[in-house]
Interface confidence: low
């Protein structure tokens, strides 16, 4: 079959840049390097049919399906998708190859399916088949990494059973505390599954794929550090692997480390030791306690002892299911308009939570910080002094937790007024909730001092679910006040605000706002 053309099928993934979306030029976006789709001849098919490797595309992603044809002379082409013919304009590249492209902007379900490209060259006719589907992210998972000992080596393997296959990296830090933050210069990252250097201060393994990034810290007791005020606690679920590292540094090698569970030495096969000399010729020893798959009876106090250091313990708690422990009672706060204030939730959880703060159906990112006592805290300060109901929601694989907060902002009332044929109403949102007075303005009372008491109906505060306290007062129109100006005033401990209304015909006619502090 010597007269068959040499063809190449490629997929070009585009990084969307919003300004170009929706434009129909051939190359509307920044592109990543093309991916070869193979394009093999399909056996046992009538006619010459090439089949490209299946293409999986994320929802809203933009791609180009491209065919490069190395055949003499001109070519003509036609795209067919779901029985509809689509325009096809071949052009030639610098190597004089025919180039045919199909740009799919912002992939949707309707754009998934089989794309057939019919090409006619001077020598022959042939068909190229592309199958494009939307990547099924419902099947995606991202699991927290866990550790295993490498067979016959003093090394740890980091495993994350995730789909798609994650990129695994070790995050190492030799400083203490704050300087081990992710972007600190003290942090070293190694994109590999096996780690041999196990003497660092802080060792974490992270796995990342399309769903995000999950990390697991190697739980460490450092006998050279002052123990935490509260006993460190490590939670695991039944079946998960347990790894605790005990680390100690001494001026010479004359010391040994041992692990005990509830005052009984760990069985051989459940620990291994490594040692090295540091730069200043001191000896560093580490002793790992590990259980490949924990059961309920692995719960208890694990104590690391040394002949030259005070021993330290950690409480390992094996649970059937994950949990989130925090007080879920609602909390109400009352603050001044410029007072600095943050909501905060203190919780204990396993596995680590994902959380959000919500106000008025809008979600805000949630940061969490570990405390020394085994609890974590999440604070929210970005309320911009808007009163209403704030919701903290946290969840992990096994539990969910929601806590409600109400924020009241102490402020002077602000009055809005409206009038109809039969009544005038005033509304105010101040806090504490305002009281109301109505006054009639007349020749006798040009300063509107004549109080109206009849026909006034004050409505109890109506608290909107996401909003703020609103109080209203309604004056029913009587002959005695028709045609007059009336003034409604709302007052609380922070001040008074008034609105003047002309009572003559339907429609709101507020025209003066008095602000009296």
């Amino acid at each position: 079959n010597q007269d068959l053309p040499v063809i190449k099928c490629v997929l070009i993934n585009h990084k969307n840049n919003d300004s170009s979306v929706g434009k129909s030029s051939s190359y509307p976006m920044v592109s990543e390097s093309p991916e070869d789709l193979g394009c093999a001849l399909r056996p046992q098919s009538s006619g010459t049919v090439y089949e490209a490797a299946a293409v999986e595309v994320d929802v809203s992603a933009s791609i180009t399906l491209q065919v490069l044809v190395d055949a003499p002379g001109n070519i003509s082409c036609l795209w067919v998708f779901k029985h509809s013919s689509l325009n096809c304009q071949p052009h030639f590249d610098l190597q004089n190859r025919g180039v045919v492209s199909m740009v799919i902007l912002k992939m949707t379900e309707t754009q998934a399916g089989e794309y057939l490209l019919f090409i006619q060259s001077e020598a022959t006719n042939y068909t190229i088949l592309f199958t494009v589907s939307i990547r099924n992210t419902l099947l995606y998972t991202l699991r927290r990494p866990y550790f295993r000992k490498m067979e016959n080596q003093d090394a740890l393997v980091c495993i994350s059973e995730s789909v798609p296959e994650p990129i695994v990296e070790w995050v190492l830090c030799d400083s203490q505390g704050e300087s081990c933050k992710e972007e600190s210069p003290a942090v070293v990252k190694k994109e590999e599954k096996v780690l041999h250097e196990l003497f660092g201060t802080d060792i974490r393994c992270c796995a990342r794929n399309e769903l995000g990034r999950e990390c697991t810290r190697l739980f460490t007791i450092d006998l050279n550090q002052t123990p935490q005020t509260t006993l460190p606690q490590l939670f695991l679920k039944v079946g998960e692997p347990l790894w605790i590292r005990c680390k100690a540094v001494h001026v010479n090698h004359g010391f040994g480390l041992t692990w005990e569970l509830e005052n009984k030495a760990l069985e051989e096969g459940n620990y291994f030791e490594m040692s090295t000399y540091s730069t200043n010729r001191t000896m560093i020893r580490i002793l790992f306690a590990f259980v490949s798959s924990v059961a309920r009876n692995d719960t208890g106090y694990y104590t690391c002892s040394s002949s030259k250091h005070p021993s330290q313990s950690a409480l390992v708690t094996i649970v059937e299911k994950g949990f989130i422990n925090a007080t879920n009672s609602s909390e109400d706060y009352e603050i001044d308009q410029y007072e600095e204030f943050c909501f905060s939730v203190r919780f204990k959880a396993y596995p680590q939570i994902r959380c959000t703060w919500t106000f008025s159906r809008k979600s805000f990112p949630c940061e969490q910080k570990g405390l020394d006592n085994g609890y974590s805290i999440s604070k929210f300060c970005n309320h911009k002094h808007q009163p209403g109901e704030y919701i903290f929601h946290a969840e992990n694989d096994d539990a969910q937790f929601t806590k409600m907060f109400t924020l009241n902002i102490r402020r002077k009332p602000q009055v809005l007024a409206e009038a109809s044929a039969s009544q005038a109403s005033c509304f105010s949102d101040g806090y504490p909730l305002p009281s109301w007075t109505w006054k009639k303005c007349s020749d006798k009372s040009p300063n509107c001092t004549e109080e109206i008491t009849e026909g006034v109906w004050n409505r109890k505060a109506n608290r909107k679910v996401f909003g703020q306290w609103v109080s209203s007062s309604t004056l029913n129109m009587s002959e005695a006040i028709k045609g007059f100006l009336v003034k409604c005033c709302a007052y609380n401990s922070l001040g008074t605000s008034c609105e003047t209304i002309l009572l003559n015909s339907p429609g709101p006619f507020p025209f003066i706002q008095d602000n009296i502090s």
């Epitope: 879920n328 609602s330 929601t402 679910v465």
Partner: antibody, heavy 121, light 106 residues
């Protein structure tokens, strides 16, 4: 143990209002949402609204907006549901029900015994 | 509002039978689904919450499954006290109930 005890049956005329009470005991009243659900004779269950007993904030089903008011009295651990402008199709058993997870995302784990409200001229 | 459609609306079964009731949501509700049992003249009783979690005190013959839009309540071996009406309910948004499935004696 957790108990929700509702007020007795009521017979009302069209246009009138009814106020049903639901007294809670056996748990911390302010830490669980309370819902109201009704069931017309021989019909299914219909959600009416929810109240947060701590802050008193409420959310009502669109259908009942403007006609229903849910309130609570923390001193007596009681929630109330008032339905105004009654019509014959409001004849139903009205239930209060506690939200299982102290958040509006779980199931209703404890229910009152129900209050039959009959609207008839 | 999200519509919940239960099927069948009624079924006849014998003691010891395996019974399956399905509930379909008009849009995805993740796992925010509960199942209730109601007997005549009584308040509903929570059986399953979060689509598959068994409420404490409920016999293990009751189980729930599903996520997104399609959910199932299964009674592995029907007992005399299980003849009742069963409702599903979503709490993903404004709570709504299915129309109910009546389980009767064959």
């Amino acid at each position: 143990q957790v108990q929700l005890v509702q007020s007795g049956a009521e017979v009302k005329k069209p246009g009138a209002s009814v106020k049903v009470s639901c007294k809670a005991s056996g748990y911390t009243f302010t830490t669980y949402y309370m819902h109201w659900v009704r069931q017309a004779p021989g019909q299914g269950l219909e959600w009416m609204g929810i109240i947060n007993p701590s802050g008193g904030s409420t959310s009502y089903a669109q259908k009942f907006q403007g006609r229903v008011t849910m309130t609570r009295d923390t001193s007596t651990s009681t929630v109330y549901m008032e339905l105004s402008s009654l019509r014959s199709e409001d004849t139903a058993v009205y239930y209060c029900a506690r939200d299982r997870a102290a958040r509006p995302r779980g199931g209703f784990d404890y229910w009152g015994q129900g209050t039959l409200v009959t609207v008839s001229s | 509002d999200i519509q919940m459609t239960q099927s069948p609306s009624s079924l006849s079964a014998s003691v010891g039978d395996r019974v399956t009731i399905t509930c379909r949501a008009s849009q995805g509700i993740r796992n925010h689904l509960a199942w209730y049992q109601q007997k005549p003249g009584k308040a509903p009783k929570l059986l399953i919450y979060a689509a598959s979690s068994l409420q404490s005190g409920v016999p293990s013959r009751f189980s729930g499954s599903g996520s997104g839009t399609d959910f199932t309540l299964t009674i592995s071996s029907l007992q005399p006290e299980d003849f009742a009406t069963y409702y599903c309910q979503q709490s993903y948004s404004t709570p709504t109930f299915g129309q109910g499935t009546k389980v009767e004696i064959k």
